[in-house]
Amino acid sequence: EETSDHDNSLSVSIPEPSPMRVLLGSSLTIPCYFIDPMHPVTTAPSTAPLAPRIKWSRITKEKEVVLLVATEGQVRINSAYQDKVSLPNYPAIPSDATLEIQNLRSNDSGIYRCEVMHGIEDSEATLEVVVKGIVFHYRAISTRYTLDFDRAQRACLQNSAIIATPEQLQAAYEDGFHQCDAGWLADQTVRYPIHTPREGCYGDKDEFPGVRTYGIRDTNETYDVYCFAEEMEGEVLYATSPEKFTFQEAANECRRLGARLATTGQLYLAWQGGMDMCSAGWLADRSVRYPISKARPNCGGNLLGVRTVYLHANQTGYPDPSSRYDAICYTGEDFVDIPENFFGVGGEEDITIQTVTWPDVELPLPRNITEGEARGNVILTVKPIFDLSPTAPEPEEPFTFVPEPEKPFTFATDVGVTAFPEAENRTGEATRPWGVPEESTPGPAFTAFTSEDHVVQVTAVPGAAEVPGQPRLPGGVVFHYRPGSARYSLTFEEAQQACLRTGAVIASPEQLQAAYEAGYEQCDAGWLQDQTVRYPIVSPRTPCVGDKDSSPGVRTYGVRPPSETYDVYCYVDKLEGEVFFITRLEQFTFQEALAFCESHNATLASTGQLYAAWRQGLDKCYAGWLSDGSLRYPIVTPRPSCGGDKPGVRTVYLYPNQTGLPDPLSRHHVFCFR
């Protein structure tokens, strides 16, 4: 659009159709030329008695911002736009006021006005600029950091997006995007955007805000991914019914409406366009999400963004396909689904669907949780995720939950993208009516993912009630147990079985109390024999205060429904036999370990047996296979090179959030029992 006061006078023109649509993270040149018939400029403006004055502004609903002013060959740029805007052709071509804008972000959308004043003459032209596209963090269904470079791209493509570029992530960061999760980008680098640096998220920038980078990585390494969804012509719509839909029913319902299940990318675009739904729905990748554009406490914890409902409290796993939610459909024809076999697979081969049940609850509800960082246990890893150096971030692991004991129950937790920086990068709704404790004891950062189970020998509490048929305390050990798959995955029944399988029994409240009094601390809620759920805290800290505020003690959630899922506390008395450590040059796969122990008239030791052996003085600085497929090692005399500064049985996990059993084909030492 162009205007001038009258013919034959100053005229300004932007020869581009409006609106101009440009991609997030790209650069933009808006041509602006002016003709000044009264004062043709034939020499540099500085020689003219009255030089024209050029002013560029951006106008949005909220305000008008002057970007720069130029006159007499000098350009004064608004300090907030110092490295962002320029006049590339001025003053070399004095009548060319073309504006260049670098690294466009969503906030750069608006009406741009090129205004030229010369004496009493004044003329302007405008152009609407729409910055299109959104960057979002994407994690595979199974767990964190599972995508190699190929799979990362595939994940984006299957969600109506492409892998984001560093420029796009930078632009999203400048728009306020904050995510403490390392993700692939198109140039094969791995980065993550941090506004509020904190331990675990410092990366290569220490305490300075900015996009962290690990540089170019080997394509076989695994991380999450940052995707970029450009635009869509169709529409995202919600389908609902009183009884909601299973995943299959949701897909059918969308088809019935002449649509199909929307992808995560399409939902992000709809959210960016203002979509706001306080109800979670199925998407094409079997995830369950909901878009929040108007912050309110009872819908996603007062935060903006696309929220995600996860299966587990550590924000991994998608809900059981038979659980019921709304259906989120997409009506457009502008996306053509890429068949699964075009990525060389018949489906997500790295997915395990784990099913849990939880009460039928209204979603979403307000329980805020903040993910903490990797500041919990001493950590070593079986499968290095990246070169661990002092600055290698361990974004968001383990998750810490801010306790609010009296809040209602929900199974939604958070998502990634929020429109604004947050004090903690991701907040979501927790999965229980109290603060779920974080992982246990702080310890020095190591180079692999081991959990430090600080285990203590138990002595009897005076006057503690005898439990019929239960081994008494002296000489026994209470230990926290978690199956390899995930945190908080055991029903009461499964918890009892798990202890029995490890050669132990489920601990009683008295045994846990005795262990606590002997110094045992574990910030993980676990079943006890009386169907209560408790955890012992010697040094209270925010995510572990439970029902005791800042006082030390055994926290309790009271008697819980047996279908709820937690970890478990087991008790092992004395060892009836011996645990021995075996190694060889090429070490053993899990299967080979089983066979080897059998060939030596023994069995693979159980977790309980290893704890009992540790209690009797077994000290080995090498992790070995146990009968449940876990990898552990007993430390009696702590030393810096062997799992930290406390005695205990260390567990080696596959993932930094302390879940996942090692690959049975990986090779390790062995603990046998005879």
Epitope: F149, L157, I162, T165, A186, D187, Q188, T219, E230, F335
Partner: nanobody, 115 residues
Framework: EVQLVESGGGLVQPGGSLRLSCSAS????????MFWVRQAPGKDYEWVAS????????YYDDSVKGRFTISRDSAKNTLYLEMNNLKPEDTALYFC????????WGQGTQVTVSS
């Protein structure tokens, strides 16, 4: 600005061969999966072949397996589709794509297989 420009189409007899090219610009070609998609008159889009960013993995629709070969030259930012033993049912408009969003594809190049 992202641009994909296909070329190499034409009229060919059954059993003949063609080599399609797609010149890419405006994005990190070497870091992108790439695809060939086709649309026969009055039919839906059909994914023909895909290649990962390194060129180490290729996948084909069953209807073209053994006859078509997808490849890439990252130094030249170019994607190729070598088509041998062409059949009349291969007649279609062939598009080079880097995403499932139709609006981001090239204009296409016409392949007609007819005697």
């Amino acid at each position: 600005e992202v641009q994909l420009v296909e070329s190499g189409g034409g009229l060919v007899q059954p059993g003949g061969s063609l080599r399609l090219s797609c010149s890419a610009s405006g994005f990190t070609f070497s870091g992108s999966w790439m695809f060939w998609v086709r649309q026969a008159p009055g039919k839906d889009y059909e994914w023909v072949a895909s290649i990962n960013s390194s060129g180490g993995r290729t996948y084909y629709d069953d209807s073209v397996k053994g006859r078509f070969t997808i490849s890439r030259d990252s130094a030249k930012n170019t994607l190729y589709l070598e088509m041998n033993n062409l059949k009349p049912e291969d007649t279609a408009l062939y598009f080079c794509a880097r995403s499932p969003r139709v609006g981001s594809w090239g204009q296409g190049t016409q392949v007609t297989v007819s005697s």
